[in-house]
């Protein structure tokens, strides 16, 4: 994400996703996102966050897990897991509130 200099200090993060422009990116924080789409294996993406920090507070579900951190390359060696499959009555929503 392009970030204006006035938006505070930037951190350098590992970038590993189909949309990365290089091996690292700079942002307000670092991210790891683990996503499992229907009928596919989970995919882990690493990158930078600049907007909607509230996603960092969302609890893991069987489909997605968001992780955020604030130091240099802090997302490099992080491995995430998804919640175990739950019965429909127990399923947590993905809403980050």
């Amino acid at each position: 994400d392009p970030v204006k200099p006035s938006r505070g200090p930037l951190v350098t993060c590992t970038c590993e996703s189909p949309h990365c422009r290089g091996p690292t990116c700079q942002g307000a924080w670092c991210t790891v996102v683990l996503v499992r789409e229907e009928g596919r294996h989970p995919q882990e993406h690493r990158g930078c966050g600049n907007l909607h920090r509230e996603l960092c507070r969302g609890r893991p579900t069987e489909f997605v897990n968001h992780y955020c951190c604030d130091s240099h390359l802090c997302n490099r060696n992080v491995s995430l897991v998804l919640e175990a499959t739950q019965t429909p009555s127990e399923q947590p929503g993905t809403d980050s509130q």
């Epitope: 189909p18 990158g47 600049n50 907007l51 920090r53 996603l55 969302g58 980050s96």
Partner: antibody, heavy 118, light 108 residues
Framework: QVQLQESGPGLVKPSQTLSLTCTVS??????????WNWIRQHPGKGLEWIGY???????YYNPSLKSRVTISVDTSKNQFSLKLSSVTAADTAVYYC??????????WGQGTTVTVSS | ESVLTQSPGTLSLSPGERATLSCRAS???????LAWYQQKPGQAPRLLIY???SRATGIPDRFSGSGSGTDFTLTISRLEPEDFAVYYC?????????FGQGTRLEIK
């Protein structure tokens, strides 16, 4: 360039569920740079944010609508959708989808009018 | 939740004049994520300004944004006939995203 197009029924009966889809063309919905939003505008009124979804499927909703709103994403179809349950006449509005990044909501659909009436 | 209050509600000016629109937030806007949009009847909103002061692609330089913290301003230096519309400010730094109630800019 990226374009958004809303689609769905223009008339919904009270107590039913409003369902709309936004189709993204000219770009990937799976980019981590963007958040995909729904906004509505009641006749003659201002803009009301409904909620957003990230490519991961994570969502955030307007607290005033949270109990009735579900936003979902289908990355294989490059679409995201809005469901609003238990509608009343107060949900009659123009519904817009929009792409958001650090550069604001830079791409909007043209809007679709939904009327709630029996 | 950050409540945005725009003033004035209606602004009556003539082409060629300078327009100053105000937006006040109930709490400091996160990371300067404040935007301005223009909306004409029957059309979707159009992004004018993002990040307080950056012009969106294709926006003429007569539009400028300024401010910080809780007080923001959209200035149109010399009004053209096509500028008469409704203008909304928006904070998008943290959720819930909120819009101001709008300022209607009408021809005097």
């Amino acid at each position: 360039q990226v374009q958004l197009q809303e689609s769905g029924p223009g008339l919904v009966k009270p107590s039913q569920t409003l369902s709309l889809t936004c189709t993204v063309s000219g770009g990937s919905i799976s980019s981590g740079d963007y958040y995909w939003n729904w906004i509505r505008q009641h006749p003659g009124k201002g803009l009301e944010w409904i909620g957003y979804i990230y490519y991961s499927g994570s969502t955030y909703y307007n607290p005033s609508l949270k109990s009735r709103v579900t936003i979902s994403v289908d990355t294989s179809k490059n679409q995201f959708s809005l469901k609003l349950s238990s509608v009343t006449a107060a949900d009659t509005a123009v519904y817009y989808c929009a792409r958001e990044s650090t550069d604001g909501m830079d791409v909007w659909g043209q809007g679709t009018t939904v009327t709630v009436s029996s | 939740e950050s409540v945005l209050t725009q003033s004035p509600g209606t602004l009556s000016l003539s082409p060629g004049e300078r327009a100053t629109l105000s937006c006040r937030a109930s709490q400091s806007v996160s990371s300067s994520y404040l935007a301005w949009y223009q909306q004409k009847p029957g059309q979707a909103p159009r992004l004018l300004i993002y990040g307080v002061s950056s012009r969106a692609t294709g926006i003429p330089d007569r539009f400028s944004g300024s401010g910080s913290g809780t007080d923001f301003t959209l200035t149109i230096s010399r009004l053209e006939p096509e500028d008469f519309a409704v203008y909304y400010c928006q904070q998008y730094g943290s959720s819930p995203i909120t819009f101001g109630q709008g300022t209607r800019l009408e021809i005097k």
